[in-house]
């Protein structure tokens, strides 16, 4: 079962059924290159192997991760700090169907910390698990110097300063 | 400011490089696109470098053109000039403090002839 | 990458007319549309971004509005400065990478008689 924004999906035999109307967002890449919505039966055929992973109270289910979603707002670093207290990490994107899934769950249309920032030793933009980003798949708007972390809204990440404080996503 | 060079008559098939050198504000906070024009013609997006070093360039664009940068200068090489790159090139910057890209600082452009 | 066709090519209007010239995408852009004037010899200028938010020091008889895959350009009460080239360009971004292309119309020539 997927939960979606309090909308339950049933994903069966690669099909989805779903009780409640669903408004599709996000982009997805097809063969040809062009852009079509992500669709709901998108998201539920790629779920074939989530069926064993338990997710604590309170966190969604997607592709074999939990994900926690924050009410409240913290700076970059004490978002990371609160993941980590929790056996998590802040959200590290991997694909676009997970991208799909992330905006499906973003009510508010303000900033959410990512796993992501851009550190100076590097000079890279670096996820939290040391994993630089491939500038081949990822497009981040705003400054790439210290102190910047990286925040999706809607369909973009930003720049913005580390000390600013957003909601943030927890994965695990 | 910005400042495009580079322009010049070329023979097809020879390699040149523009550059565009900025003053005033730094490109690790600002993103830069390269435009052209041909004489009477509009104008064609070419590519872009982001703030963190990253080129990326429109579909017809890719393996014709190189985008790179220093601290101060974003070039623009054309790798294998056809007379149908005649133009003028122009290099404009991204004002950087908004969620809309708001391109609105460009320079005056330089003339390649092919 | 997203095809942006401008409409009309060229248009004749008196002093203190209006000039309406459109843009289409062939895809959603959203609110991600900027409009440029241009005169001969001149780098363009930037008029309007964000589809309907006017660049500073830009007169308020530019008017853009539009979203989606529509978008227009309103020049009101037309002065023989205003006479110049028209652009609008797609300033179309997400977080993923190939769809950061910002490809422009075709242009749109304003002659103010």
């Known amino acids: 079962l997927l939960v979606s924004q309090g909308v339950l999906l049933k994903c069966q035999k690669g099909s989805c059924s779903n009780a409640t109307q669903y408004e599709d967002t996000g982009d997805l890449k097809v063969n040809n290159g062009t852009r079509r919505n992500i669709s709901n039966k998108d998201l539920c055929a790629s779920r074939s192997a989530d069926q064993t992973v338990l997710c604590q109270s309170e966190w969604l289910k997607y592709q074999g991760k939990c994900y926690w979603f924050s009410n409240e707002m913290k700076s970059w670093s004490d978002s990371y700090v609160y993941c980590l207290e929790r056996k998590s990490h802040l959200l590290i994107i991997h694909d676009q169907l997970e991208m799909a899934f992330i905006q499906k769950n973003l009510r508010q249309l303000n900033y959410v910390w990512i796993g992501l920032n851009f550190t100076s030793l590097k000079m890279t933009w670096t996820w939290v698990d040391g994993s630089p980003i491939d500038s081949k798949i990822f497009f981040i708007k705003g400054p790439a110097k210290e102190n910047s972390c990286a925040a999706i809204k809607e369909s973009k990440i930003f720049s913005e300063t580390c000390s600013s404080v957003f909601k943030w996503i927890c994965q695990y | 400011s910005l400042e495009e060079s580079g322009g010049r008559l070329v023979t097809p098939g020879t390699p040149l490089t523009l550059t565009c050198t900025v003053s005033?504000?730094?490109?690790?906070?600002?993103?830069m696109i390269w435009v052209r024009q041909a004489p009477g013609e509009g104008l064609e997006y070419i590519g872009i470098?982001?703030?963190?070093?990253s080129a990326y360039y429109a579909s017809w664009a890719k393996g014709r053109f190189t985008i790179s940068r220093t601290s101060t200068t974003v070039d623009l090489k054309i790798t294998s000039p056809t007379t149908e790159d005649t133009a003028t090139y122009f290099c404009?910057?991204?004002?950087?403090?908004?969620?809309?890209?708001?391109?609105?600082?460009w320079g005056q452009g330089t003339l390649v002839t092919v | 990458d997203v095809v942006m066709t401008q409409t009309p090519s060229s248009a004749s209007e008196p002093v203190g007319g209006t000039v309406t010239i459109k843009c289409q995408a062939s895809?959603?852009?959203?609110?991600?549309l900027a409009w440029y004037q241009q005169k001969p010899g001149q780098p363009p200028k930037l008029l309007i971004y964000?589809?309907?938010t006017l660049e500073s020091g830009v007169s308020s008889r530019f008017k853009g509005s539009g979203s989606g895959t529509e978008f227009t350009l309103t020049i009101s009460d037309l002065e023989c400065a205003d006479a110049a080239t028209y652009y609008c360009?797609?300033?179309?971004?997400?977080?993923?990478?190939?769809?950061?292309?910002?490809?422009f119309g075709g242009g749109t020539e304003v002659v103010v008689k």
């Open positions: 005033g504000f730094s490109l690790s906070n600002n993103g």
């Open positions: 470098m982001n703030t963190d070093g």
């Open positions: 964000g589809a309907s």
């Open positions: 895809e959603s852009i959203s609110s991600d």
């Open positions: 404009a910057r991204d004002a950087g403090s908004n969620e809309h890209f708001v391109f609105n600082l």
């Open positions: 360009q797609s300033t179309y971004y997400s977080w993923y990478s190939s769809n950061c292309v910002f490809p």
